[in-house]
Structure formats: C-alpha cells, structure tokens
C-alpha cells in the first residue's frame, strides 16, 4: 500500500481542515488508514481523524481544530496499521479555503432595485470576519449566455442592482461565494442558489 | 477541592536514586499536563520537567536530562519523577504542579494552578 | 532558552501604597492576539508558590483584584494597587510559551 498523490489540506480558518490524497489503489479509507495531527505547540498531544473515501483510491479527512491563528502548524503522519506511508506539516493560515455564505436572499420590492444579501461565514470573533469579499453570480435560466459576475469588494454582505439590468419576464439564480486577500486564500465554495422571478416596469416611452 | 500531594523525599547520597510520587485529586488527572518545579534552598525556583496528559510527551531541564525519568498513572490519578545518579545540587525542595489541559487540539494554559505542599530531597554523603 | 530578567529584586512598600514588577524576556512570549504565555506567581514564607497572573493579564481564581498584570511581547509588569501586609514574599514571572519553562530571579516585596 503506497500513497500515490500526497495529502493536500486547506484550512476554513475556524474549526476545520480537509485533507484529500490518493493511493495506488482502491482503498477502504475508514478501516485502513489513520491520519493522526499534533499541534506544534508545548505538551499538546496527538489526535486522529479517521478518513473517507472520495472515489475509488481517494480519500479524505476532515481535522477538527479548537480554532487557528497564523502561527500554527501541525505535524501530519498518515499510518496503514503500524505502517507510516508519510509524514507531512501543515500551516493553515497559508492554505485557506473560506467557508461558503449563507443564507442568500434576493429582495425583489424596493422599487426597480433587487437587494442581493447572504450571510457571513464566520463569527464577529474571527479575524476573517472582517476581510472577507465576495463574487455574486447571476445567471438566466432560459439563457446560458445570459451570465454575469459581480465583485463585492466592500465588506458588507449585500449587493444592489438595477433590475433593468436583467431581461424582465424570466427566471434567474443567484449564487455568492468569498475569498479573503489578506491570507490569499482560494474561493470558497459557492452558496446553494436562491431563484427569483425578474419583472419590472418599462419606462413609459413618449412619441 | 482540587488537590496535590507529594512524596517520596528523603536524604540519599551522591550516585543514588529516589521516585517521588504526586497524587491528583479533585480533577480529572488524565486530561492535564502536569509539571515538577524545584527549589534549592535559598535559590528561585527551577523547572524540572512536564509531561503531557497522555503521557505520550515529556520535556526536561538540560541539568536532569538523562539521569530523571517523568511519568504518570492515569489509573491511579499519580505523576512520579525517578531521580537516578543524584548529585549534591539536586538538593532541594521538588513541587509538583497541575499544567495545562492537553486533551484539546490546542492546549488551553490556566497557568500553574495547583502546586503541592512540596518535599524535599536532600543529596548528602 | 529565554531569559526572564525581573527588577527590581527588592521592593520595600508602605501598606496602602502601589507596587509594580517588572519582568522582561529574551524573546516575545506573544503567540497570538492577547496570549502572551507569562505568569506570576507569589511565594510566601515557607509555602508553596500560588498562580496570581496567566496568560499576561488574566487574574486567576481567587486572586484579589488589586493584583493585575499588563504588556506584551517581551515586556510585562505586575501591579499591585494596594499593597496589604499579606502581600510579602517572593514574586516570580515566568515563562510557558517553550520548553524550558524559565522563571525571573524572583522579587522580594517587603513592608516598611
């Protein structure tokens, strides 16, 4: 039993860290394989998260951590039994991947103006709190060429748009997912998309 | 009422060995580190080493390195400190102490809250 | 191993008046926003030491609240609001960030 691709782990940068990797052959993660973490740190101990299967010979593992802060760094060991297939360390504040948004919600009855707001991830306490932005994706049901981004970069969780902005009569999706610059984290995932049906008035034309 | 107790001091000569012992109670012992701290007389105090809640980690001064073993019986609620090859500036007074809780991912430090009454370890010929 | 330097070693203090200790290490015991991993701890005559300060400025249980400890990175004080005769003995800062935990020499408070 070997490792094929080597544990990769990202952090949320609140209580969890997914690791994923490959091995030479199909597995059963759960029975075979340990992957045990130990924060770098005086007197702190071993604990072992129990892997899953993520495809034929994939697995992963998702670390429970009490919290992060940018100094940490945990040591990683990967054992088949008795047997260590690898040794590895891990820094989260250098690998984040933030939490998805929630709770998005498209308010369609302040004028011709749609509200676009969704939950932050993250607890006040938490420094990504305050340094997250957002991509906001809209996209036409009927229309695949009817699809657009926009940047929040501000960090209140709303967006504002014109409804004119977007075809009248038809259905639209709304999904929204955040990144933060200050750790250079990747994208999060995005959010399950809200649906809204996008009717406004036309302009009264004059002949 | 959280409590630490020690012994197994006594007078032993240069070369010689001693166990002290230091029995927890009123706390869940297994899920703390826990520390020994000495005090030569008329001197400041000395760390001598800690050990995990598991006991899988052990950390020694450079002075008793090699010559003290710590260890700890979760089953019996106690922590000892072997001393071998004694020598005459091991003399002192040795306190245990509760350190902090190691069962977490990240170990949560309350300080040196409960230390013992101490007993003293005299290295004489 | 860091060195934990205290001063002034002794400190005569008239009852009712403040007192202040200081202690400095060789390297910063902050590891993260608000945890500085330094104590103080008090010695009284023939006892055994008892924790006053964790974490740089957390008063431990039971601790009156005349007792306070401030500063970060390197540089720490202890302060005393109102020194009251019980307060004499030795106080010692010390170090939990690494191993070798260090203690400073130790402050001797005295009452005039």
């Known amino acids: 039993m070997k490792v094929l691709q080597e544990p990769t782990c990202v952090s949320d940068y609140m209580s969890i860290s997914t690791c994923e990797w490959k091995m030479n052959g199909p597995t059963n993660c759960s029975t075979e394989l340990r992957l045990l973490y130990q924060l770098v740190f005086l007197l702190s101990e071993a604990h072992t998260c129990i892997p899953e299967n993520n495809g034929g010979a994939g697995c992963v593992c998702h670390l429970l951590m009490d919290d992060v802060v940018s100094a940490d760094n945990y040591t990683l060991d990967l054992w088949a039994g008795q047997q260590l297939l690898w040794k590895g360390s891990f820094k989260p504040s250098e690998h984040v991947k933030p939490r998805a948004p929630g709770n998005l919600t498209v308010h369609t009855n302040v004028s011709d103006t749609l509200l676009l707001t969704w939950s932050n991830p993250y607890p006040p306490d938490n420094y990504l709190y305050n340094h997250l932005t957002y991509a906001v994706n809209i996209w036409s049901e009927n229309d695949p060429a009817d699809f657009r981004i926009y940047n929040v970069t501000y960090l209140e969780p709303s967006l504002r748009i014109a409804a004119s902005t977007l075809k009248s009569g038809i259905s639209y999706r709304a999904r929204v997912r955040a990144w933060a610059q200050c750790y250079n984290t990747t994208w999060s995932e995005w959010s399950p998309s809200t649906k809204w049906h996008n009717s406004y008035r036309e302009p009264f034309e004059q002949h | 009422e959280v409590q630490l107790v020690e012994s197994g001091g006594g007078l032993e000569q240069p070369g010689g060995s001693l166990r002290l012992s230091c029995a927890g109670s009123g706390f869940t012992f297994r899920d703390f580190a826990m520390t020994w701290v000495r005090q030569a007389p008329g001197k400041g105090l000395e760390w001598v080493s800690s050990i995990s809640g598991s006991g899988d980690n052990t950390y020694y001064a450079d002075s008793v390195k090699g010559r003290f073993t710590i260890s700890r019986d979760n089953s019996k609620n106690t922590l000892y400190l072997q001393m071998n090859s004694l020598r005459a500036e091991d003399t002192a007074v040795y306190y245990c102490a509760k350190d902090r809780l190691s069962k977490t991912i990240r170990p949560r430090y309350y300080g040196l809250d409960v230390w013992g009454q101490g007993t003293t370890v005299t290295v004489s010929s | 191993d860091i060195v934990m330097t205290q001063s002034p070693l002794s400190l005569p203090v008239t009852p009712g008046e403040p007192a202040s200790i200081s202690c400095t290490s060789s390297?910063?015991?902050?590891?993260?926003?608000?945890?500085?991993?330094v104590d103080w701890y008090l010695q009284k005559s023939g006892q055994s030491p008892q924790l006053l300060i964790y974490?740089?400025?957390k008063r431990a249980s039971g601790v009156p609240d005349r007792f306070s400890g401030s500063g970060s990175g390197t540089d720490f004080t202890l302060k005393i609001s109102r020194v009251e005769a019980e307060d004499v003995g030795f106080y010692y800062c010390?170090?939990?960030?690494?191993?070798?935990?260090?203690f400073g020499q130790g402050t001797k408070l005295e009452i005039k």
């Open positions: 390297q910063s015991l902050l590891y993260s926003i608000g945890k500085n991993y």
């Open positions: 010390m170090q939990s960030l690494t191993s070798p935990y260090t």
């Open positions: 974490l740089g400025n």
